[in-house]
């Protein structure tokens, strides 16, 4: 049974930093590219970032480039999103996901809410 | 970035009737491996998204066959042959052929009373 559980969300002031985690279980984590996708309250989905199975490549949405860093620890089966210089427009539910593009099944976590507010 | 434009943004449908959602991309979604990476997601109220269709027309395992995808190049369509109550939600297209990946704005499917 595949499980993705995000944590680390909360209320943070503009300009501050926050680190999200996604604990993976039930599959061979170190073989998969992993994504972060976010959804602002009442809005649509926005793809945020991907990291390669071995951590060697990372791609980001233009809106977070230079501020957010995706990383992973394959020994801990955990995906991370380090968010810095946070802005009000980063307020969203952040989902980690596997297999967005290929494969016969996709998997998403339940999401963690990040609120950027003074 | 590749812009994904969905229409309509809101879609009221009678139960048992067909529904069709369009998705247009600002560039061709044919990837270097020859595959066209247009994906459709469903997000029911209060739930995480789930993928319905990948590579334009391939149904994800467990997705009912009333959902079908079609299209090529820059024009794509998601069809629901007979809408059921559980199909209520927002439908998103996603392109996975160019970095960064980009979603359409979403189409809200509602049941007509």
């Amino acid at each position: 049974q595949v499980h993705l559980v995000e944590s680390g969300g909360g209320v943070v002031q503009p300009g501050r930093s926050l680190r999200l985690s996604c604990a993976a279980s039930g599959f061979k984590f170190r073989s998969y590219g992993m994504h972060w996708v976010r959804q602002a309250p009442g809005k649509g989905l926005e793809w945020v970032a991907i990291i390669w199975y071995d951590g060697s490549k990372r791609y980001y949405a233009d809106s977070v480039k230079g501020r957010f860093t995706i990383s992973r620890d394959n020994s801990k089966n955990t995906l991370y999103l380090q968010m810095s210089s946070l802005r009000a427009e980063d307020t969203a539910v952040y989902y980690c996901a596997r297999d967005l593009i290929t494969g016969t099944t996709d998997y998403w976590g339940q999401g963690t809410l990040v609120t950027v507010s003074s | 970035d590749v812009v994904m434009t969905q229409s309509p943004l809101s879609l009221p449908v009678t139960l048992g009737q067909p529904a069709s959602i369009s998705c247009r991309s600002s560039r061709s979604l044919v990837y270097s491996d020859g595959n066209t990476h247009l994906i459709w997601f469903q997000q029911r109220p209060g739930q995480s998204p789930r993928r319905l269709i990948y590579r334009v027309s391939n149904r994800v395992s467990g997705v009912p066959d009333r959902f079908s995808g079609s299209g090529s190049g820059t024009d794509f369509t998601l069809k629901i042959s007979r809408v059921e109550a559980e199909d209520v939600g927002v439908y998103y297209c996603l392109q996975g052929a160019h970095w960064p990946y980009t979603f359409g704005q979403g189409t809200k499917l509602e049941i007509k009373r």
Epitope: T104 | S32, G96
Partner: antibody, heavy 124, light 111 residues
Framework: DVLLQESGPGLVKPSQSLSLTCSVT?????????WIWIRQFPGNKLEWMGY???????NYNPSLKKRISITRDTSENQFFLKLNPVTTEDTATYYC?????????????????WGQGTSVTVSS | DIVLTQSPASLAVSLGQRATISCKAS??????????IHWYQQKPGQPPKLLIY???NLESGIPARFTGSGSGTDFTLNIHPVEEEDAATYYC?????????FGGGTKLEIK
Amino acid sequence: DVLLQESGPGLVKPSQSLSLTCSVTGYSITSGHYWIWIRQFPGNKLEWMGYITYDGSNNYNPSLKKRISITRDTSENQFFLKLNPVTTEDTATYYCARDVADSYGNGYDAMDYWGQGTSVTVSS
Amino acid sequence: DIVLTQSPASLAVSLGQRATISCKASQSVDYDGDNYIHWYQQKPGQPPKLLIYAASNLESGIPARFTGSGSGTDFTLNIHPVEEEDAATYYCQQSDEDPWTFGGGTKLEIK
């Protein structure tokens, strides 16, 4: 194209150390992938020995863990196998290889690029 | 360790016919629907060459007459139609669980 080439001594004495080099051309070993050592014994049985990742971490076959070390020299684009001590049972053809990955971020722990292999005999 | 048992150990097939090689795993290598079984071809004096990865994905540049199938513990490599150049030894490999292990090989001869 990606090319891998093994080099090292053809003959090693029992209880000594075996050191092999894999020279990689056409791809930087720090750019990604797992860089793997595999050996094939007389009689053709294949054994996965271990790998080093693009960022220098390791994963070894538990049966060899006490004797094996895989390291690298990023400036020379080479990675190395050290087996210490060796016995006659380590006589084999040693291959270096690279793992398969797709364009979507996924890896498969299969090997698509291999060196030609180097034959090692352990004998006094 | 996961043991992979290949059968037959050798087979002789006529040109144009079908060759079928079986690989049985001592436990399931089906990790959430992803089958970590791979197939290689090895000719004398050469390193193994990847044919199929993840049970059924054809490696780039490999002819479509090579197909892989199976799930759980039972996997098959089919070659059809067999050509002269297919004479070689074929190995399956699992990477579902460390250590990665290989089957004992199947030697294919062309009649």
